[in-house]
């Protein structure tokens, strides 16, 4: 029978009763960066090449006994995950080894790095189709193997890391927190985080996705026919290298950007259990399972976004964070989270010749988030609409006043420190969608964006009793791209997208003691573009 | 049900062509390895070799590399076993089998094609 | 390649009586990843195809009658036969699947005495 995480992989139109999909990956080459593999097992013999390279430290202690069988076991396995007849992700797929890791599994930044390197020459001599690079290793944090992936990715490679097994933030892990690389942690059969001893998966901001990575069936050193099951979030990276590989067959053109976006669209949806995650960590950690997409075709005409979080601010006073779209990706909206609720909210502002989003931390605040709404839109124009504080009691309110130019999203900043404790609530004059409001002692950004055939609308879902969460979603066939609250009189803590729903988180009312603070309202900014609808249509 | 069906009995002459072919039914072909082996008369049973019919992936014993070819055909669910040009010492009954990777054993084995090579 | 050496070559046991095979492989066919051994015994009667007796060295295929069983572990294995039937006569081989070349053992032959 198929094996579990076969089958938690494969959309329900794929399944019989074996692992067939429709394209095995074919026109991809994957490199992995690994240990030694045993390249005549019968699950990968002719699919992987073993290449020349060969960098790693020697061994520690002087009664290591070199058994090739044990030296091979991580990299078999893993090229087996990946691609291999019977047990792998993408059949079809051709994998090239480097080995930079030893017999115990241990190898260098610079191994690492002269791995990527020789890559990255090797693409230059014979340029072939799609790469897809896997590192199924994690150390700690290096700005110069993050650089390095860097590099390789804006080369056009796609790089699949495994986020660790520290039961850690993976932020502090290399190539792990490379926001270039695609990071996958590993969850169970029961869709849970995966425990390995007293540590488990890594988690947090710098993770994308996970896949399986818990008693994981693959090819095994010790025989030309044994099979073995393994555990980590190097198995999840490889299911990944695996659904990237079979994407990138049928589409050979998506740039990272657009593979990243939908590995995210397609993955199943809040079928983790968040409470396995530190708390601080469960809101920036995100709750997809990778799969295969339901069809390897005709995912072109829909609008893809995803969240981005910063780093966390730190609590000094004038702290910022500030979160940042890949560059083929818009920033179509900016948000703030501070899970004390002192913050000064957050704005758009251009840095580099592209917007980011920045997060004001205030004072007595023990930090902020940074949160970015980053979405696929080909041939955009944005920009951002300010209007400072008014000085009107009615609050501070701006329009996307250019001519074919719809609102994206809203941010609202302001100088004084508690702002929203006990002012008046705004409310939106009804018939103006287009605008977004705000206190009159907040500055308001509206992201204004024109895109062939785009289109948006508002949507709130407001609750008069205070609420810890209020979340109000976009319907089928529509893609948050903004995720913003009514100013009201309750506290809030600040908003962010969860897939297509906004989440306004407030402060706990057990906590506050009160009820008489009032209404707290979601707002979600919904769009979806006519224009990519028609092209996909016109392709098939 | 699960069913490996094999070509007729072949007489040749030395020198000959010949391919012989084994058909499975009632399970997915191309998820099995089919395995080809050799019974000369009143001997023992000898490996020769095996395909993987999802890909055509093959392997040969040492002793049957570079004298036979195995092949197979996804499309009609068929394995074959051919020479170029039969020996006198290549009559014996030949087997395919089917083993799955989680079962590299041969559970299902096809009825024997008996080729006999005489001048 | 590893070499599965059988014996006896040729075995003729009364009906009702036990009936004992031993195949010895030239290196081991145990693997630590799995703790399997990678072993399997057939049954070829005259003019049929083999027919999958024991696989993993010691598990029945579904439809073999109980009174087949087999042990050992690493190198040395059995084929136990506890009450020999008449329609038991046939040649027995056992056969390694961990490493390529697969390879059988001679055989033993299982006649009534």
């Known amino acids: 029978s198929i094996p579990w995480n076969l089958e938690r992989i494969t959309p329900p139109r794929y399944r019989a009763d074996e692992y067939q999909p429709p394209d095995g990956g074919s026109l991809v080459e994957v490199y992995l960066l690994d240990t030694s593999i045993q390249s005549d097992h019968r699950e990968i013999e002719g699919r992987v090449m073993v290449t020349d390279f060969e960098n790693v430290p020697e061994e520690d202690g002087t009664r290591f006994h070199r058994q090739a069988s044990k030296c091979d076991s991580h990299g078999t396995h893993l090229a087996g995950v990946v691609s291999g007849r019977d047990a792998g992700v993408a059949k079809g797929a051709s994998m090239r080894s480097l080995r930079v890791l030893n017999c115990q599994g241990k190898g260098t930044v610079s191994g690492t790095l002269i791995g990527l390197e020789f890559i990255r020459k090797s693409q230059l001599v014979q340029p072939v189709g799609p790469l897809v690079v896997l590192l199924p290793l994690a150390g700690g944090y290096s700005r110069v193997l993050n650089a390095a992936c860097q590099r390789l990715a804006r080369a056009g490679v796609v790089l699949v890391t495994a986020a660790g097994n520290f039961r850690d933030d993976a932020c502090l892990y290399s190539p792990a927190s490379a926001p270039e690389v695609i990071t996958v942690g590993a969850t169970n059969a029961q869709d849970q985080p995966v425990t390995l001893g007293t540590l488990g998966t890594n988690f947090g901001r710098c993770v994308d996705l996970f896949a399986p990575g818990e008693d994981i069936i693959g090819a095994s050193s010790d025989c030309s026919t044994c099979f073995v099951s393994q555990s980590g979030t190097s198995q999840a990276a490889a299911h990944v290298a695996g659904i990237a590989a079979m994407m990138l067959s049928a589409e050979p053109e998506l740039t990272l950007a657009e593979l990243r976006q939908r590995l995210i669209h397609f993955s199943a949806k809040d079928v983790i259990n968040e409470a396995w995650f530190p708390e601080d960590q469960r809101v920036l950690t995100p709750n997809l399972v990778a799969a295969l997409p339901p069809s390897t075709h005709g995912a072109g005409w829909q609008l893809f976004c995803r969240t981005v979080w910063s780093a966390h601010s730190g609590p000094t006073r004038m702290a910022t964070a500030v979160a940042r779209c890949a560059p083929d990706e818009e920033l179509l909206s900016c948000s703030s989270f501070s899970r004390s609720g002192k913050r000064r909210g957050e704005r758009m502002e251009a840095q580099g010749g592209k917007l980011v989003c920045r997060a004001h931390n205030a004072f007595g605040g023990e930090g902020v988030y940074a949160i970015a709404r980053c979405c696929l839109l080909p041939q955009a124009n944005c920009s951002v609409h300010t209007a400072p504080p008014a000085e009107a009691s009615m609050g501070t309110r701006v329009h996307c006043h250019q001519q074919g130019h719809v609102l994206t999203g809203c941010s609202s900043h302001w100088e004084v420190e508690d702002l929203g404790t006990h002012k008046p609530p705004v409310l939106r004059p009804r018939g103006q969608p287009n605008q977004c409001v705000g206190h009159r002692e907040a500055s308001i950004h509206a992201s204004c964006c024109h895109a062939p055939g785009l289109e948006c609308k508002v949507k709130e879902h407001g609750i008069p009793a205070p609420q810890e969460q209020v979340t109000v979603a976009c319907e089928e066939g529509w893609t948050l791209t903004g995720c913003s609250a009514l100013p009201g009189t309750s506290h809030v803590l600040g908003a962010y997208a969860v897939d297509n729903t906004c989440v306004v988180r407030s402060r706990d009312v057990s906590t506050t003691g009160s009820t008489s603070e009032g209404a707290v309202t979601a707002v979600a900014i919904c769009c979806r573009s006519r224009h990519l609808a028609q092209a996909s249509q016109e392709l098939q | 049900q699960v069913q490996l069906v094999q070509s007729g009995a072949e007489v040749k002459k030395p020198g000959e062509s010949l391919k012989i072919s084994c058909k499975g039914s009632?399970?997915?072909?191309?998820?099995?390895?089919i395995t080809w082996v050799r019974q000369m008369p009143g001997k023992g049973l000898e490996w020769m070799g095996m395909i993987y019919p999802g890909d055509s992936y093959t392997r040969y014993s040492p002793k049957f590399q570079g004298q036979v070819t195995i092949s197979a055909d996804k499309s009609i669910s068929t394995a074959y076993l051919q020479w170029s040009s039969l020996k006198a010492s290549d009559t014996a009954m030949y087997y395919c089998a089917r083993d799955y990777w989680s079962k590299p054993f041969f559970d299902v084995w096809g009825q024997g094609t008996l080729v006999t090579v005489s001048s | 390649d590893i070499v599965m050496t059988q014996s006896p070559d040729s075995l003729a046991v009364s009906l009702g009586e036990r009936a004992t095979i031993n195949c010895r492989s030239s290196q081991s066919v145990l693997y630590s990843s799995n703790n399997k051994n990678y072993l399997a015994w057939y049954q070829q009667k005259p003019g049929q195809p083999p027919k999958l007796l024991i696989y993993w060295a010691s598990t029945r295929e579904s439809g073999v009658p109980d009174r087949f069983s087999g042990s050992g572990s690493g190198t040395d294995f059995t084929l136990t036969i506890s009450s020999l039937q008449a329609e038991d006569v046939a040649v027995y081989y056992c056969?390694?699947?961990?490493?390529?070349?697969?390879?059988f053992g001679q055989g033993t032959k299982v006649e009534i005495k």
């Open positions: 056969q390694q699947y961990s490493s390529f070349p697969i390879t």
């Open positions: 009632g399970y997915s072909f191309t998820d099995y390895y």
